[in-house]
């Protein structure tokens, strides 16, 4: 008998300093480009090697970005979200939601999987 897959959702504040080549990640999502069904949120689709986000190590592909410098990312067009990041300044504070896959075995064993992407 297979265990069911659940998700453990956690939130984290990540402070990044924009590096020589920027923050170093890609995003998908927005009200005009839903990445997840019935969710117009902004998600990390790619983290670039040696960029600020990669060197910091906390932001993961598949994370949902809830806010940038305290500004909520709900109900934004995709390009508006991109512009918000590009104009966010040198020190950038991200509120992110990590979604960890948790395997529940038949006898309640919990094993953490990789972040969903």
């Amino acid at each position: 008998m297979n265990g069911r897959v659940d998700y453990l959702v956690t939130e984290e504040e990540i402070n990044l300093t924009r590096g020589p080549s920027g923050l170093g990640f890609n995003i998908v999502g927005g009200t005009d480009q839903q990445y997840v069904s019935n969710d117009s949120g902004i998600y990390v689709s790619r983290i670039k090697e040696n960029g600020a986000a990669a060197l910091d190590g906390r932001l993961q592909e598949g994370d949902k970005i809830l806010s940038v410098n305290g500004q909520d990312l709900k109900n934004l067009l995709h390009q508006d979200a991109v512009d918000l990041f590009r104009n966010a300044g040198y020190a950038v504070s991200l509120r992110v939601q990590h979604r960890l896959q948790v395997q529940n075995g038949p006898i309640g064993h919990r094993g953490e999987g990789d972040p969903s992407g």
Epitope: L23, F25, I27, D32, Q33, H78, Q79, R86
Partner: nanobody, 127 residues
Framework: QVQLVESGGRLVQAGDSLKLSCAAS????????MGWFRQAPGKEREFVAG????????YYGDSVKGRFSISRDNARNTVYLQMNSLKPEDTAVYFC?????????????????????WGQGTQVTVS
């Protein structure tokens, strides 16, 4: 992942126009930033034009501004490069490229290293 196939390259005369096409596989084409690059013999690959996932934002390399125009049809999974007033120095292999989503840094769309997926290229020769 996406696979990209360019077409439309050929030999033309200086001053002529030409339209290149790039057909992409996959159902999520509308979430990809698309770009055109070119590479002349003995030279580095050069950014030509790019378009945001929706097609609302378009950007061009300095050497083609005012002559080339990029567009995309998300219903047909295709991106186009309309090239007008062609010059001999436009002779190169033209590559279609893509990456998922949008990069959040200024100028990132212009960098070869930003793009994850590449076509095989189509030759354009201007005599």
């Amino acid at each position: 992942q996406v696979q990209l196939v360019e077409s439309g390259g050929r030999l033309v005369q200086a001053g002529d126009s030409l339209k290149l096409s790039c057909a992409a596989s996959g159902r999520t084409f509308s979430t990809y930033t698309m770009g055109w690059f070119r590479q002349a013999p003995g030279k580095e690959r050069e950014f030509v034009a790019g378009t945001s996932p929706s097609g609302d934002n378009r950007y061009y390399g300095d050497s083609v501004k005012g002559r080339f125009s990029i567009s995309r049809d998300n219903a047909r999974n295709t991106v186009y490069l309309q090239m007008n007033s062609l010059k001999p120095e436009d002779t190169a292999v033209y590559f279609c490229a893509a990456f998922r989503g949008s990069c959040v840094d200024d100028g990132c769309d212009f960098r070869v290293s930003q793009y994850d997926y590449w076509g095989q290229g189509t030759q354009v020769t201007v005599s």
